[in-house]
C-alpha cells in the first residue's frame, strides 16, 4: 500500500513538475524590465527563451520571435536545448512511469518489469528535473552578469548632454516557475526510485524449509516468506512479495527429498 | 465617433480649487488610458498627467505632484483633474487626451479644451 | 526629465515646397526592447486641439495626408511636409513617449511664404 502510493504521488508531483517546466519554457517573461531605480518608462520591456516582448502603457503588447538561429546567444541556445531536453525526458519518463503503475493492470506484467518500468521513469524524471533547473540556473546566471554590466554603465554618454538609458532587466516570472517546476520533477523522480525499491522482488528466494513438530507442522520460510501455523499437510503459506505476484495457493509446490529434516 | 468633452474650467483666485471633467464617448472608455495635456495661453504643450485604464498606475509632472490628482470612474465614462492651490502659473486650456492603443503611446484623440483662468 | 529642442522656431515656406522641422531629444528614444523609436508628431491649427500626424517617428496615423512623413532614430527626428498646402500652416509639436513625464518640444509655427 505505502508502495502504491509513494509511486502514485512521484507520479502526480512530476506530472505537475514536467507540466511546470513546459509552462516555463513557453512563457515570455523569462526575463523582465527592471523598473527599481530607473527612469519611468512608458513601455514595459520582457523576453522569453522565444520572443522579447513591449507593452505599452496604453496596454497594447507586440511580441516578436528570434527568428535567427545562429545570431542568437550560445547562452540562449544552451538553456533551450536544456529545456527541451528536460521536456522530452519527462514526456517519456511519464508514459513509462504509467505503465509502471502497480495501480494499472496491463496483461500479465511481472512485478520485476514494473520495478525497471518504476526506475527507469524515476531516472527519467531526477534527469529531467535537473536539466530545467540547471537550464533556468544559466539563464539566471547570464541575466545577474549583464544586470551588474549594465549598470556599471547605464548611461553611456553618446556625446554633449545627449543619453541612451540601458534597459536592465531581471528575474522573470519564468524563472521561479521553473525552479519550482524542476524541483517538483526531481522529488517526483526520486519517489519513484523509492517506490521501485518496494516493487523489487528479493534476490534470493530460498526453498522453503518445514519443521515438523509432533502435534501439529510449523512451516518457516526465510527471505521474503511470512511463518505461519497450521495441521497437517493443508498447511499454505504466502510470500510477502514475488516477482509473479503469485501467492502459494496459486502454485503447489510439491515435497521433494530436501524439504524434511 | 470618438468624443472628449472637457468642463469645470473657469475663473478662480490663487489658493483656490477646481474640478475639471471631460466626459468621453465613441469608444469602451474603460479599455483606455486617459491624459490630461495643458497649454498656457500663446505657450506650448504641457502634459500633466496619465491614467490606466484600470486607475493604477498613475503619473504625473513632478511640479505638479501633491497638487493635482487624476481620477476616473468607468461607470460614468469619466475622467477628472482634481486641482488643488492654484497659482497664477496654472492658468491655461487644459486637454483631456486618450492614450491611444498600437499608436506607441501616442494620445490619438484629444477634447476641445476648457479654460482654466487663476488670477486675484 | 527629457528635454525636447524643435527646430526652427518658425518656418515660411512656399505653397508646394517642402517644409522641414527637426526635433531632438536629450535621450534615446529608441526601445531596445522591439527596436522602436517612441516619438509622436502633432499639428494644431489656431483655436483647435493638437491632432496626432505621426506616431513611432514614421508611422502615419490614419487619415493623415502621404505628404507629411516622419523620420529619424535615437535622438534625431524629422517631420516632413513634401508639398506645403495652405491647410497645412500650424504649429507642430514634438513628443517624447517613452519616458514620464511625456515631453513636448517648444513646437515650430509653419507660415506660407
Known amino acids: 500500500m505505502a508502495v502504491t502510493a509513494c509511486q502514485g504521488l512521484g507520479f502526480v508531483v512530476s506530472l505537475i513538475g514536467i507540466a511546470g517546466i513546459i509552462a516555463a519554457t513557453c512563457m515570455d517573461q523569462w526575463s523582465t524590465q527592471d523598473l527599481y531605480n530607473n527612469p519611468v518608462t512608458a513601455v514595459f520591456n520582457y523576453q522569453g527563451l522565444w520572443r522579447s516582448c513591449v507593452r505599452e502603457s496604453s496596454g497594447f503588447t507586440e511580441c516578436r520571435g528570434y527568428f535567427t538561429l545562429l545570431g542568437l546567444p550560445a547562452m540562449l541556445q544552451a538553456v533551450r536545448a536544456l529545456m527541451i531536453v528536460g521536456i522530452v525526458l519527462g514526456a517519456i519518463g511519464l508514459l513509462v512511469s504509467i505503465f509502471a503503475l502497480k495501480c494499472i493492470r496491463i496483461g500479465s506484467m511481472e512485478d520485476s518489469a514494473k520495478a525497471n518500468m518504476t526506475l527507469t521513469s524515476g531516472i527519467m524524471f531526477i534527469v529531467s528535473g535537473l536539466c530545467a533547473i540547471a537550464g533556468v540556473s544559466v539563464f539566471a546566471n547570464m541575466l545577474v552578469t549583464n544586470f551588474w554590466m549594465s549598470t556599471a554603465n547605464m548611461y553611456t554618454g553618446m556625446g554633449g548632454m545627449v543619453q541612451t538609458v540601458q534597459t536592465r532587466y531581471t528575474f522573470g516570472a519564468a524563472l521561479f516557475v521553473g525552479w519550482v517546476a524542476g524541483g517538483l520533477t526531481l522529488i517526483g523522480g526520486v519517489m519513484m526510485c523509492i517506490a521501485c525499491r518496494g516493487l523489487a522482488p528479493e534476490e534470493t528466494n530460498y526453498k522453503a524449509v518445514s519443521y515438523h513438530a509432533s502435534g501439529h507442522s510449523v512451516a518457516y520460510k526465510p527471505g521474503g516468506f511470512k511463518a505461519s501455523t497450521g495441521f497437517g499437510s493443508n498447511t499454505k503459506n504466502k510470500k510477502i512479495y514475488d516477482g509473479g505476484a503469485r501467492t502459494e495457493d496459486e502454485v503447489q509446490s510439491y515435497p521433494s527429498k530436501h524439504d524434511y529434516v | 465617433e470618438v468624443q472628449l468633452v472637457e468642463s469645470g474650467g473657469g475663473l478662480v483666485q490663487p489658493g483656490g480649487s477646481l474640478r475639471l471633467s471631460c466626459a468621453a464617448s465613441g469608444f469602451t472608455f474603460s479599455s483606455f488610458g486617459m491624459h490630461w495635456v495643458r497649454q498656457a495661453p500663446g505657450k506650448g504643450l504641457e502634459w500633466v498627467s496619465y491614467?490606466?485604464?484600470?486607475?493604477?498606475?498613475?503619473y504625473y509632472v513632478d511640479k505638479l505632484k501633491g497638487r493635482f490628482t487624476i481620477s476616473r470612474d468607468n461607470a460614468k465614462n469619466s475622467l477628472y483633474l482634481q486641482m488643488n492651490s492654484l497659482r497664477a502659473e496654472d492658468t491655461a486650456v487644459y486637454y483631456c487626451?486618450?492614450?491611444?492603443?498600437?499608436?506607441?503611446?501616442?494620445?490619438?484623440?484629444w477634447g476641445q479644451g476648457t479654460l482654466v483662468t487663476v488670477s486675484s | 526629465d527629457i528635454v525636447m529642442t524643435q527646430s526652427p522656431d518658425s518656418l515660411a515656406v512656399s505653397l508646394g515646397e517642402r517644409a522641414t522641422i527637426n526635433c531632438k531629444s536629450s535621450?534615446?528614444?529608441?526601445?531596445?526592447?522591439?527596436?522602436?523609436?517612441?516619438l509622436a508628431w502633432y499639428q494644431q491649427k489656431p483655436g483647435q486641439p493638437p491632432k496626432l500626424l505621426i506616431y513611432g517617428a514614421s508611422t502615419r496615423e490614419s487619415g493623415v495626408p502621404d505628404r507629411f512623413s516622419g523620420s529619424g532614430s535615437g535622438t534625431d527626428f524629422t517631420l516632413t511636409i513634401s508639398s506645403l498646402q495652405a491647410e497645412d500652416v500650424a504649429v507642430y509639436f514634438c513628443?517624447?513617449?517613452?519616458?514620464?513625464?511625456?515631453?513636448f518640444g517648444g513646437g515650430t509655427k509653419v507660415e506660407i511664404k
Open positions: 513628443q517624447n513617449d517613452l519616458f514620464y513625464p511625456l515631453t
Open positions: 491614467i490606466s485604464s484600470g486607475s493604477s498606475p498613475i
Open positions: 535621450q534615446s528614444l529608441l526601445n531596445v526592447g522591439n527596436q522602436k523609436n517612441y
Open positions: 487626451a486618450r492614450a491611444g492603443y498600437a499608436v506607441r503611446n501616442a494620445l490619438d484623440y
